[in-house]
């Protein structure tokens, strides 16, 4: 807490700027104006304060608005928001993706901090869902922000949200995950033309029950063997040796250099000889 | 930079119990998704269970109501209690912590089931 003491004569501020940097602590309190302050948040960020004297500058902001800051605040903290705890987070009602996305940019390329932990999670509350644009911008500063997500949590992101998703913010999730995700995508994407849709639904695949990938099997959608590895075992065993064949297409020759891992073992153990042999492959059950 | 640190390991009977630790150190805030995977020799690594941020757990078929993940938050630990073990168990099992930005893998702990 910082003592109140009298503005010396000729050091009040008319306005934010480089000149505060030499003012010690108790004349920033006595000499700048809380309200002056909120209005030229911009500029704070442009000028080399220390963290004692952005102490300070946030002291002012929190007796200015004790019930928490405006949007039009927030959305210029800049690196003042580091300052913030998750407490005074959750005073706030931040509505605009204009103003999560400058927060976010504050800690870009860092781990999740708790404050940017509970900025999101007010975010997400206050828009009553996880909807396209959001996820968008989550995902682009934090990849693995879906597959951070409990299944129940996903339940609730709406099918059109998922065409924000690209491949690479599956790869942390697990099968729980994709489980509760590909159906979502299923709805998403399912005004798609065949090759179109097998693209987009690819990364889901790792959810898909047995009847969409025989029904994938009759589309000549060529499966590679990574994607074909991360399908539920439980999705594959009761396919056909044909259904494999057309699921996979050019690739089913890679099955003899998987053939000891899951899914291909088991499912390999579920096949008549007969079948295997077809193959060509030297598969043995 | 975060740690983990499996241990708890070993050689047991079928039917028997191990219940295994993933010390982590480090700091890592927000969501946090600590899952176990497993790799025995020559195959590749899959997927056991995961404990989510929420408190929720998932588990792979294979494991499902023999296994049981836990964590103590306090501890920055997470556990894989394995109960009536069988061969097919045997692997080395790992630890991973997920966050948004990050995924952070341990070194893995041996675990042996003899019939």
């Known amino acids: 807490e910082v003592e109140k003491t009298a503005c010396p004569s000729g050091k009040k501020a008319p306005e934010i700027d480089e000149s505060l940097i030499f003012y010690k602590k108790w004349e920033l309190e006595a000499c700048v104006d809380a309200a002056l302050l909120a209005t030229q948040m911009d500029r704070v960020n442009a000028i080399p304060f220390t963290y004692e004297q952005l102490d300070v500058l946030k002291h002012k902001l929190d007796e200015l608005y004790p019930q928490g800051y405006p949007e039009s605040v927030i959305q210029h903290l800049g690196y003042l928001f580091l300052k913030m705890s998750p407490e005074d987070i959750r005073k706030w009602n931040v509505t605009s993706l204009e103003t999560l996305k400058a927060l976010l940019e504050v800690n870009k390329g860092h781990e999740m901090s708790p404050q940017v932990a509970t900025l999101i999670d007010r975010f997400v509350k206050g828009r009553g869902q996880l909807d396209k644009d959001t996820l968008d911008t989550l995902t682009a500063f934090y990849p693995g922000y879906l597959c951070s997500l409990s299944p129940e949590e996903l339940s609730s992101v709406p099918p059109s949200s998922i065409w924000a998703v690209r491949p690479q913010d599956l790869d942390t999730c697990d099968p729980r995950q994709l489980d509760v995700l590909y159906p979502k995508a299923r709805l998403a994407f399912q005004n798609m033309n065949g090759s179109e849709y097998f693209v987009k639904i690819q990364s889901f695949l790792g959810g898909a029950p047995t009847e969409d990938l025989k029904a994938l099997s009759q589309q000549n959608v060529s499966m590679d063997l990574a994607t074909f590895m991360k399908l539920r075992t439980d999705a594959v065993l009761p396919l056909t040796v044909a259904e494999v064949q057309k699921l996979l297409g050019p690739h089913v020759e890679g099955l003899k250099a998987e053939e000891r891992h899951r899914p291909v073992r088991d499912w390999i153990l579920r096949q008549r000889q007969d079948d295997l042999d077809t193959l060509g492959l030297g598969l043995q059950g | 930079q975060v740690q983990l640190v499996e241990s708890g390991g070993g050689l047991v009977q079928a039917g028997g119990s191990l219940r295994l630790s993933c010390a982590a150190s480090g700091s890592t805030f927000g969501r946090i998704v600590m899952r176990w995977y497993r790799q025995a020799q020559g195959k590749q690594r899959e997927w056991v269970a995961s404990i989510y941020d929420s408190g929720s757990t998932s588990y792979s078929d294979p494991v499902q109501g023999r296994f049981t993940i836990s964590r103590d938050n306090a501890r920055n630990t997470v556990y894989l209690q394995m109960n009536s073990l069988r061969p097919a168990d045997t692997a080395v099992y790992y630890c991973?912590?997920?966050?948004?930005?990050?995924?952070?893998w341990g070194q893995g702990t041996q675990v042996t089931v003899s019939s």
């Open positions: 991973n912590l997920g966050t948004a930005l990050s995924s952070y």
